[in-house]
């Protein structure tokens, strides 16, 4: 059974992941640039199901494309430093999903824009955090 300290650690990691995703979405929503239109043309794979920590495998597999899209957005008004940001998210995701079990991610048929993708994973984090508090 998970201990109180392990639950607290999981909750803090999920809160950090949530904040990182919210920071990206906020940066994109603030973005007044022709590049935004182009960013929205990139398609992301969405998980068929995302209800457990193991499903973060689906997020991990989309981190490289996410970094590429964020690199496109780099400018003096975009302060997210994609390499550092994605590296941070990657570390959190690896810790949260664990490496013991190999989970094959199943994706939905429909792809999504970066905004839909971020909102999906933000909702995922919020829903898991809610079960922990």
């Amino acid at each position: 059974a998970p201990t109180s300290s392990s639950t607290k650690k999981t909750q803090l990691q999920l809160e950090h992941l949530l904040l990182d995703l919210q920071m990206i979405l906020n940066g994109i929503n603030n973005y007044k640039n022709p590049k935004l239109t182009r960013m929205l043309t990139f398609k992301f794979y969405m998980p068929k199901k995302a209800t457990e920590l193991k499903h973060l495998q689906c997020l991990e597999e989309e981190l490289k494309p996410l970094e590429e899209v964020l690199n496109l957005a780099q400018s003096k008004n975009f302060h997210l430093r994609p390499r550092d940001l994605i590296s941070n998210i990657n570390v959190i995701v690896l810790e949260l999903k664990g490496s013991e079990t190999t989970f094959m991610c199943e994706y939905a048929d429909e792809t999504a824009t970066i905004v839909e993708f971020l909102n999906r994973w933000i909702t995922f984090c919020q829903s898991i955090i809610s079960t922990l508090t």
Partner: antibody
């Protein structure tokens, strides 16, 4: 539990910049993301943005985009908020807050010619 | 951006009174709501997080309820040290936004 200590009051002229510091002690510096919130005299609370102290990346409220820069120095466990092109409406108390549950004491910035 | 409104904007009450402050979000924020208390010249102090969870060290006379768009902060028996301004704040999405505040003063 982390404690946050902010730099002292500042008086600035319109058009100038101000840099407010927020030093953390008592807990791991990178444990909590740091928000900056300001409060004009007699007014409510206004969120300015957030910085991840470990990664050093930040995200800002649209209102301050292009005028605010949040940075950090991990060697001194300090985060900074710099606001440029100051105008009289920027006169306020500026707070840093770790995870929005531990707050610094506030720094009064007065913008006056 | 999510707009937060509070009512009343101010109220006068006596020690021992039960006080209720309401907060409304312009769109659903689940339970991603916090309540703060602020006294003049001081930083805000977190009272309630996740709509109903009491922050460590906060007296049990404070309680929070609600979800979606409507939230309530209740002080079951007002104490002299509770005269202050109270703010709600949503953390469902960025930018983080605060309510305009409710000032509780002595009747």
């Amino acid at each position: 539990q982390v404690q946050l200590v902010q730099s002292g009051a500042e008086v600035k002229k319109p058009g100038a910049s101000v840099k407010v510091s927020c030093k953390a002690s008592g807990d791991t510096f990178t444990r909590h993301y740091v928000h900056w919130v300001r409060q004009a005299p007699g007014q409510g609370l206004e969120w300015m943005g957030i910085i991840n102290p470990s990664g050093g990346y930040a995200s800002y409220a649209q209102k301050f985009q292009g005028r605010v820069t949040m940075t950090r120095d991990t060697s001194t466990s300090t985060v900074y908020m710099e606001l440029s092109s100051l105008r009289s409406e920027d006169t306020a108390v500026y707070y840093c807050a770790a995870g929005l549950f531990i707050w610094g004491q506030g720094t009064l910035v007065t913008v006056s010619s | 951006d999510i707009q937060m409104t509070q009512s009343p904007s101010s109220l006068s009450a006596s020690v021992g009174d039960r006080v209720t402050i309401t907060c409304r979000a312009s769109q659903s924020i689940g339970r991603w709501l916090a309540w703060y208390q602020q006294k003049p010249g001081k930083a805000p102090k977190l009272l309630i997080y996740s709509a109903s969870n009491l922050e460590t060290g906060v007296p049990s006379r404070f309680s929070g309820s609600g979800s979606g768009t409507d939230f309530t902060l209740t002080i079951s028996s007002l104490q002299p040290e509770d005269f202050a301004t109270y703010y709600c704040q949503q953390a469902n999405s960025f930018p983080v936004t605060f309510g305009p505040g409710t000032k509780v003063d002595i009747k």
